[in-house]
């Protein structure tokens, strides 16, 4: 009977081991070991035993001891099990961005490592074990699927191998892959909310606000705002899970027409867009034309109002007939028309909205000078010593100068409070003079003495 010791050995790859071969008889005819491994006999041996050192053991092997005794030939094998940790433990790259609510597949590749029966592959989130599987195949590939939430943003995922040799050598060997950080994102299915004027007048400024709620992580969101081909530079305000982008838009004549206002919110590898039509219009105030802004009374005046070709005008509240961009009327100028305002109101429909513009012109009517009985009575009778205010109003445009003189020298104090004396009595010649000429009127003042009362 041939014996081998130890009957089983677990050793690191490339390691050495001493194996004892012994025969059951005292004087074996032959005693030895058969192995492809490099072996060296350790001397001195005994009559019925030999010790061998096997070196550079790279793989599992079963060296065989044999002996030849008088009662026959026999052999025995020792089981050499080589252990080694994996040469490569690698977690497959994670997607650059992972949508929240979608499952993530983690994939780990393990190259090498033995004995495989003692090799376990674990997928980890931080230090938390997500999955534990045996290593099968070369390379071994282990996968697991995990649901992804917002709290997984920034989490580190890795793959770890455990070579558990505790039953044999009281050792546990661990290899961990480089960690991969997960970036998750949540972009709602709802498009951004866009608030902007539907119509904007050329050479004015408008404000555009684009906002979106339910974003995660909001700090990573990018906003693109454009009016037509013009890139807008918004000021972005971030909330907990929301953002608001505000931009000022100054529109010039180049922008006149229909433009698309576009707001795009980009997060992860997704975009949500909202488009809105903005109509930019040019609408100068209507022109109010008078044949002449200054005319003499009795002159015929044409008042004309003209606006944007697509506008409808009203002149002094009267719509153009037929409705359109032009209205006019004819009048004979009277003094009452002096300072009269002619107002033209133009209305233009822009993208279903009515916009209004007004223009006003004043007519100056030259007339007079005039001295009427109504405003400059020809006769005054006042009691002596009473307080009176002589009144005489001259009319005209330009406003005439008025003088009332008795005997060419003594003035009547028009508009002033006076004590009536005998000196005030008499006939005054009132003269109203302007650049248009002069008119005169006699005014008589009678003074009643107290004896007549």
């Amino acid at each position: 009977q041939t014996s081998v010791f130890p009957p089983e050995v677990i050793l690191p790859r490339g390691g050495s081991v001493k194996v004892n071969c012994s025969a059951s008889c005292d004087q074996p005819i032959s005693l030895g070991m058969e192995t492809p491994l490099p072996k060296k006999e350790i001397l001195p041996g005994g009559n019925n035993w030999k010790m061998y050192e096997l070196s550079n053991v790279q793989e599992d092997s079963q060296p065989m001891c044999y002996s030849n005794c008088p009662d026959g030939q026999s052999s025995a094998k020792t089981l050499l099990t080589v252990y080694w940790t994996p040469e490569r433990v690698e977690l497959a790259p994670l997607p650059p961005w992972q949508p929240v609510g979608k499952n993530l597949t983690l994939r780990c590749q393990v190259e090498g490592g033995a004995p495989r029966a003692n090799l376990t592959v674990m997928l980890l989130r931080g230090e938390k074990e997500l999955s534990r599987q045996s290593a099968v195949g070369e390379p071994a590939e282990v996968t697991t699927t995990v649901p992804v939430g917002r709290d997984d943003h920034g989490a580190n995922f890795s793959c770890r191998t455990e070579l558990d040799l505790r039953p044999y050598v009281l050792k546990l060997f661990e290899n961990t892959s480089a960690p991969h950080q997960l970036q998750t994102f949540d972009l709602p299915a709802t498009p951004p909310q866009l608030v902007s004027p539907q119509v904007l007048e050329v050479d004015t400024q408008g404000t555009v606000v684009c906002s979106l709620d339910g974003l995660f992580p909001v700090s990573e969101a990018q906003v693109s705002l454009a009016l037509g081909d013009q890139k807008l530079n918004p000021t972005i305000t971030y909330g907990n899970n929301s953002l608001s982008a505000k931009a000022s838009v100054k529109v010039t004549a180049e922008e006149e027409g229909t433009q698309q206002l576009l707001c795009g919110v980009m997060l992860g590898n997704q975009t949500q867009e909202t488009r809105q039509t903005v109509t930019i219009y040019s609408f100068p105030a209507p022109n109010v034309n008078l044949t002449k802004p200054e005319v003499s009374e009795g002159t015929e005046v044409i008042v004309e109002c003209e606006a944007h070709p697509r506008a409808k005008v009203m002149l002094n509240g009267v719509p153009a007939q037929p409705p359109g961009p032009r209205a006019q009327f004819l009048l004979k100028a009277t003094p009452e028309d002096n300072g009269r305002s002619f107002s033209c109101s133009a209305t233009l429909e822009v993208a279903g909205q009515l916009v209004h513009k007004n223009q006003t012109r004043e007519l100056r009517v030259l007339y007079g000078p005039r001295l009427d009985e109504k405003d400059c009575p020809g006769n005054w009778t006042w009691p002596e010593n009473s307080q009176q205010t002589p009144m005489c109003q001259a009319w005209g445009n330009p406003l005439p100068q008025l003088k009332c003189l008795k005997d060419g020298t003594f003035p009547l104090p028009i508009g002033q409070s006076v004590t009536v004396t005998r000196d005030l009595e008499g006939t005054y010649l009132c003269q109203a003079r302007s650049t248009r000429g002069e008119v005169t009127r006699e005014v008589t003042v009678n003074v009643l003495s107290p004896r007549y009362e």
Partner: antibody, heavy 119, light 110 residues
Framework: QVQLQESGGGLVQPGGSLRLSCAAS????????MSWVRQAPGKGLEWVSA????????YYADSVKGRFTISRDNSKNTLYLQMSSLRAEDTAFYYC????????????WGHGTLVTVSS | ASELTQDPAVSVALGQTVKITCQGD??????ASWYQQRPGQAPVLVIY???SRPSGIPDRFSGSSSGNTASLTITGAQAEDEADYYC????????????FGGGTKLTVLG
């Protein structure tokens, strides 16, 4: 569908005048800005002039300012380019094109009309 | 006037991806539009705004913008894509309303 058809091209002597027309159909003409773009034979595109939908604003390239006049008749759905003091370097295919707004990109183009300035 | 600069010529193998670029200061403020012109034909708008295609333009055409550069990308170029391509933008210098690049002649090989 949108159609733009230029006409009025031909051979003209240096210093001469020519009026190009562009008849438009298939869209609301008065709501669109219109432009003229030219292309000398074998060369690239060059913007020439533009006019707003209402006709209230007009724009010209420096190379034609003071010599060319753009206008439109919205009642006839027609765009015009009055060209005077013509030079040899004005020889080109002249395209009319429409834009949703005055400074905007060109949505549709006509097939072009050739203007040759030569003595 | 501001200028837009394009490579005069670019070639691509059939079915491969090609990027045509356009550079100019105005592109910091405005998006470029891109026009395709086949020999003897009028130009046709293929891309406008940030990356919008008019109806009828295949989705293999796409646009992008970064800084002072605009790009037109054709993913999976077809023989019928062989043409001149012009970029065009508003003129931020204010001298002209719009300016064109010099054009890029695209050749599809194979």
């Amino acid at each position: 569908q949108v159609q733009l058809q230029e006409s009025g091209g031909g051979l003209v002597q240096p210093g001469g005048s020519l009026r190009l027309s562009c008849a438009a159909s298939g869209f609301t003409f008065s709501s669109y800005a219109m432009s003229w773009v030219r292309q000398a034979p074998g060369k690239g595109l060059e913007w020439v002039s533009a006019i707003s939908g209402s006709g209230g604003s007009t724009y010209y390239a420096d190379s034609v300012k003071g010599r060319f006049t753009i206008s439109r008749d919205n009642s006839k759905n027609t765009l015009y380019l009055q060209m005077s003091s013509l030079r040899a370097e004005d020889t080109a295919f002249y395209y009319c094109a429409n834009s949703a707004y005055t400074g905007g990109w060109y949505d549709y183009w006509g097939h072009g009309t050739l203007v040759t300035v030569s003595s | 006037a501001s200028e837009l600069t394009q490579d005069p010529a670019v070639s691509v193998a059939l079915g491969q991806t090609v990027k045509i670029t356009c550079q100019g200061d105005s592109l910091r403020t405005y998006y470029a539009s891109w026009y395709q012109q086949r020999p003897g034909q009028a130009p046709v708008l293929v891309i406008y705004g940030e990356n919008s295609r008019p109806s009828g333009i295949p989705d293999r055409f796409s646009g992008s913008s970064s800084g002072n550069t605009a790009s037109l990308t054709i993913t999976g170029a077809q023989a019928e894509d062989e043409a001149d391509y012009y970029c065009n933008s508003r003129d931020s210098s204010g001298n002209h309303l719009r300016v064109f690049g010099g054009g890029t002649k695209l050749t599809v090989l194979g």
